[in-house]
Amino acid sequence: ATKLTEEKYELKEGQTLDVKCDYTLEKFASSQKAWQIIRDGEMPKTLACTERPSKNSHPVQVGRIILEDYHDHGLLRVRMVNLQVEDSGLYQCVIYQPPKEPHMLFDRIRLVVTKGFSGTPGSNENSTQNVYKIPPTTTKALCPLYTSPRTVTQAPPKSTADVSTPDSEINLTNVTDIIRVPVFN
């Protein structure tokens, strides 16, 4: 079993979770990657995935989730914008590698979203929020459906303590309606 740890982020409603998942360039640069939520007692659920093969620096948006895969950096950047209290939960990045089971990227993210004013006077997030107001072009993409021959055990408890979970215990579900969002730097 691989020992997994969690990194906790406590954010306010309306803020943006912005994390990066590091991966091995040579092995996974063009592999399809996904952002999942792990709910207690359930299999990991895929919320968004990159295209297959994954395109370099090409934003994919699913609702309030934006994925960008930077092949030259070996990083998958995940942003969840306009956070809501109900977004609270345990998340992880995984890499699809059929026919093998998905490869999990460390560490898991424990997101806690609370109500309340997120900023101080004069604070803003406009420079990034404007990006997502650009009229998107829509495309269809499917995240693979994996069925594991192994039994999926209960998801880790809601704590920030280290947890041990075998990599093989990851299952994914379909996600449709992937949206491409052009980003201008």
Epitope: E10, L11, V19, S118
Partner: antibody, heavy 119, light 108 residues
Framework: EVQLLESGGGMVQPGGSLRLSCAVS????????MSWVRQAPGKGLEWVSE????????YYADSVKGRFTISRDNSKNTLYLQMNSLRVEDTAIYYC????????????WGQGTLVTVSS | EIVMTQSPATLSVSPGERATLSCRAS??????LAWYQQKPGQAPRLLIY???TRATGIPARFSGSGSGTEFTLTISSLQSEDFAVYYC??????????FGQGTKVEIK
């Protein structure tokens, strides 16, 4: 317990070289990005260089680009900083720091090693 | 490069009082901001990250707020061990990762 221990600092003349080492323990070294951060005497903190864990990607501050090289030996749980063409303004305490898996913020730091560049 | 500006440079506060430190980014960094504490002769210590999340083992009297370009570190009731220099750092987008110039919290 996470521990980071720097070594290799000392006095060197301008134009000289030094190699800093940072031996780590208490976490799975290969999984995490590591950075070098320096602090000139009586001054603030300046990020110097970063090396990612899985990807091995490297990044440098403009002030050291082309002169410093960051590397790591995952089998020895050690991070390195090769410093060439040293300048007086490179004089500082050099800290190695472990980063979060998910972002470049520094959750564990070494005690630092002093590099003095002087003629 | 994102420039981080802290104010004030020095803050004189009596023990038990509240201290409010400010950090401003030259462009939006969302919530990608951390605060560190450094005491003389010691390495920095992570206090707050993600603008408002307390790091492991950090007392509840330390709190962070803000988003975008304006951030605040508040120490609700200063203890003797809190007198130190405090730095903010942005970790938005790509390197270079930049720090503010620091705020020294001294005994009034």
């Amino acid at each position: 317990e996470v521990q980071l221990l720097e070594s290799g600092g000392g006095m060197v003349q301008p134009g000289g070289s030094l190699r800093l080492s940072c031996a780590v323990s208490g976490f799975t070294f290969s999984r995490y990005a590591m950075s070098w951060v320096r602090q000139a005497p009586g001054k603030g903190l300046e990020w110097v260089s970063e090396m990612r864990g899985s990807s091995g990607s490297t990044y440098y501050a403009d002030s050291v680009k082309g002169r410093f090289t960051i590397s790591r030996d995952n089998s020895k749980n050690t991070l390195y900083l090769q410093m060439n063409s040293l300048r007086v303004e490179d004089t500082a305490i050099y800290y190695c720091a472990k980063e979060f898996s998910s972002n470049s913020l520094f959750d564990y730091w070494g005690q630092g090693t002093l590099v003095t560049v002087s003629s | 490069e994102i420039v981080m500006t802290q104010s004030p440079a020095t803050l004189s506060v009596s023990p038990g009082e509240r201290a409010t430190l400010s950090c401003r980014a030259s462009q939006s960094v969302n919530a990608n901001l951390a605060w560190y504490q450094q005491k003389p002769g010691q390495a920095p210590r992570l206090l707050i990250y993600g603008a408002s999340t307390r790091a492991t083992g950090i007392p509840a009297r330390f709190s962070g707020s803000g988003s975008g370009t304006e951030f605040t570190l508040t120490i609700s009731s200063l203890q003797s061990e809190d007198f130190a220099v405090y730095y903010c750092q942005q970790f938005y987008n790509w390197p270079p990762w930049t720090f503010g110039q620091g705020t020294k919290v001294e005994i009034k």
